[in-house]
């Protein structure tokens, strides 16, 4: 006869990591006499007999999960009990392993350019699965803008133009890989005004035109109202580019009037509207100039992009409308006037023209924008481009050229920082150095006005021929 | 030749003011960022203010809220205000011609906050 | 604020001697393709002088013994004198301006063997 023994457990449970849909079993080896009864708790719930999900084979030794859920995952227990001693018990965890799962995929998105857009990209897995996101074909990075969530969510803030496109999100564990649909985000911009109409100050029975530019998706209309009522006199002529609406209103000036461009477009049953307001006067006026902030950003247009440095970052002037858009159209409207000028000076003008109207940024309390330094722009005034500025100056010009009514500024040399004195201030053209060195015959220029600003430094050894009162080391 | 010279430094009690000033020539005052940094006896550099062409101020924050800096592009000469100052405020005060980097230092003028 | 680093404190060197000195900076301080980084000399009893500048620009008039290196998103940056002269004896600071406040490191003493 054997004698009684109380339960114990040989082979305690063990951590078992188990697949979702796939098997998890414990096994819980019980040595005793009388043989035990062997129940199975869950997080300390009793497992019942009959659960049709689990099995429980070998007097109890053994228990089956037949098809793994992701709530399975927990504490598991074995307790042994055969009436002598007290019951004994064993516990072991499930960790439920996930393939990466996307139960809430993102959807398409159409939201109106500067407001915030949310694509939700909700995962399941475990290990808890990394969310990256793919624009087009190439990975989405984030930057003060644009942000995945904790959840896994893409927010963009203050969405523009250019971060429409498709979108997918992808979920990623050691286990495996899950993609997303590709979305749509589609940008609706409001009408804006990029270009307002200049204000004139003319002799009685002049022509005067003026000039509106705005962008929108869709591309807006333009109308025009003259003291408070419809033009009633003029001509207007319109053009569209690239989602830009140019619209010249030409008038035969006999009495002064508030002009106003009034651009609009459609979103839906809403329709969004900007006004801007000039004024025609017959009288003296000065136009002032303010300085005004603005940002840095990469430059993107096309103009300048082999005169500025690759992936420069520029100064966006914010008292356009659209900064960026504004910029481009200026000088794109100045890079077709420098056709007339001579092979020598278009270069440099072109080097002087960017660089003055996308200024590096530099850094420091707060990025801000860099003119240019004084001795390259008087390379340009007094040597590239002698010729041209002195015709220029004779005609009491401010400007390099000529386009159409509006005169686009060159910087005032005498008004920038020289590099001698904080080369840190300024920016350096490097085609003019590029030149210097590579350029073998040129007319000497002497300057007009020596600045005593910039020291007599010596001619470079080429014979690039500086003028005395600057040179370009 | 850039030169830069201070005055308006000496011995004040704490909590008391002091005006420095820089006057400037050599070149075109009004293009250029000015700065004031100073130097502790036996220290190391500590950078206090800057103000850019257009006469905006930029501030440590270890003189926020005492210090100003000020330009008068006409005079060619910079300005400190020192208010509620405190014996840790005692160094040679320079100020410096400079945008990025600090291109050209005065001589520097002395400031002692002792009771 | 970010927070430069320089070593070693102080170094004697001997005339004629490679001298070299590290800064160290808490984060990268490049900008626009620039780092902006600068190095001073403060001989006794004088005016700091700028060196260096954007990491390895020399400032005009410094003779070209003195030399910066450093590129790239670099956090570590490297004031050279190739060959030390009497005149050399000072104290030499890095700063960063890559954004407020303007710091500077505390100084490396160099001194004549």
């Known amino acids: 006869e054997k004698l009684p023994k109380a339960p114990v457990i040989t082979t305690p449970l063990e951590t078992v990591d188990a697949l979702v849909e796939e098997v998890a079993t414990f096994m819980c080896a019980v040595e005793s006499y009388p043989q035990p009864e062997i129940s199975w708790t869950r997080n300390k719930i009793l497992i019942k007999l009959f659960d049709t999900r689990y099995s429980i084979r070998e007097n109890g030794q053994l228990l089956t999960i037949l098809s793994v859920e992701d709530s399975d995952d927990g504490i598991y227990c074995c307790i042994a009990n055969n009436g002598v001693g007290g019951a004994v018990e064993s516990c072991g965890a499930l960790q439920v392993k996930m393939k990466p799962k996307i139960t809430r995929p993102p959807i398409n998105v159409k939201i109106i350019e500067g407001l915030k857009a949310v694509l939700p990209c909700t995962t399941m897995g475990n290990p808890k699965p990394s969310v990256s996101w793919i624009k087009g074909d190439n990975a989405l990075r984030e930057n003060s803008r644009i942000a995945v969530l904790e959840s896994g969510s893409l927010r963009i803030h203050n969405v523009q133009k250019e971060d429409a496109g498709q979108y997918r999100c992808v979920a990623k564990n050691s286990l495996g890989t899950a993609y997303s649909k590709l979305v749509k985000l589609e940008v609706e911009v409001f009408a804006r005004i990029l270009r307002a109409p200049e204000s004139h100050n003319v002799t009685f029975g002049s022509f005067v035109t003026l000039r509106c530019t705005a962008i929108g998706i869709p591309v807006p209309t333009i109308s025009w109202i003259e003291n408070g009522n419809a033009v009633s006199s003029g001509s207007i002529q319109e053009s569209v580019k690239d989602r830009v609406i140019d619209s010249r209103l030409q008038l035969f000036i006999t009495k002064p009037g508030l002009y106003t461009c009034i651009a609009t477009n459609k979103h839906g049953e809403k329709f969004s509207t900007a006004k801007a307001a000039a004024t025609v006067s017959i009288a003296e006026w000065s136009k002032s100039q303010k300085d005004s902030q603005g940002y840095c950003a990469q430059y993107r247009g096309e103009v300048c992009d082999a005169v500025l440095a690759k992936d420069a970052l520029v100064f966006f002037n914010t008292s356009y409308r659209d900064p960026e858009d504004a910029q481009e159209l200026l000088i794109h409207t100045a890079w077709n006037e420098l056709k007339a000028v001579s092979p020598l000076c278009r270069p440099a003008a072109e080097a002087l023209l960017c660089n003055h109207l996308f200024q590096e940024c530099s850094p420091g309390v707060v990025p801000t924008p860099m003119p240019i330094c004084r001795e390259y722009c008087l390379a340009v005034k007094e040597l590239f481009c002698a010729k041209e500025w002195q015709a220029m100056e004779g005609k009491a010009h401010r400007g390099l050229y000529r386009s159409g009514m509006h005169l686009l500024p060159v910087p005032e040399c005498s008004k920038l920082p020289s590099m001698h004195r904080d080369p840190t201030a300024c920016t350096r053209l490097p085609y003019l150095d590029y030149k210097k060195e590579n350029i073998t015959t040129f007319p000497s220029i002497t300057s007009s006005r020596p600045s005593a600003d910039i020291p007599n430094l010596p001619a470079s050894t080429s014979s690039f021929a500086v003028s005395p009162a600057y040179s370009m080391t | 030749e850039v030169q830069l010279v201070e005055s308006g430094g000496g011995l004040v009690q704490p909590g008391g003011s002091l005006s420095l000033s820089c006057v400037a020539s050599g070149f075109t005052f009004s293009l250029y960022y000015m700065n004031w940094v100073r130097q502790a006896p036996g220290k190391g550099l500590e950078w206090l203010s800057v103000i850019d062409t257009h006469s905006i101020a930029y501030y440590a924050d270890s003189v926020k809220g005492r210090f100003t800096i000020s330009r008068d592009n006409v005079k060619n000469t910079l300005y400190l205000q020192l208010n509620n100052l405190k014996p840790e405020d005692t160094a040679l005060y320079y100020c410096?011609?400079?945008?990025?980097?600090?291109?050209?230092w005065g001589q520097g003028t002395q400031v002692t906050v002792s009771s | 604020e970010i927070v430069l680093t320089q070593s070693p404190s102080s170094v004697t060197a001997s005339i004629g001697e490679k001298v070299t000195i590290n800064c160290e900076s808490s984060q990268s301080v490049l900008y626009n393709q620039k780092n902006y980084l600068n190095w001073y000399q403060q001989r006794p009893g004088q005016s700091p002088r700028l060196l260096i500048y954007?990491?390895?620009?020399?400032q005009s008039g410094v003779p070209d013994r003195f030399s910066g290196s450093g590129s790239g998103s670099t956090t570590d940056f490297t004031l050279t004198i190739s060959s030390f002269q009497p005149e050399d004896v000072a104290v030499y600071y890095c700063?960063?301006?890559?954004?407020?406040?303007?710091?500077f490191g505390p100084g490396t003493k160099v001194e004549l063997k």
């Open positions: 954007w990491a390895s620009t020399r």
């Open positions: 410096v011609l400079g945008r990025t980097a600090l291109v050209r």
């Open positions: 700063q960063q301006a890559y954004n407020a406040p303007l710091t």
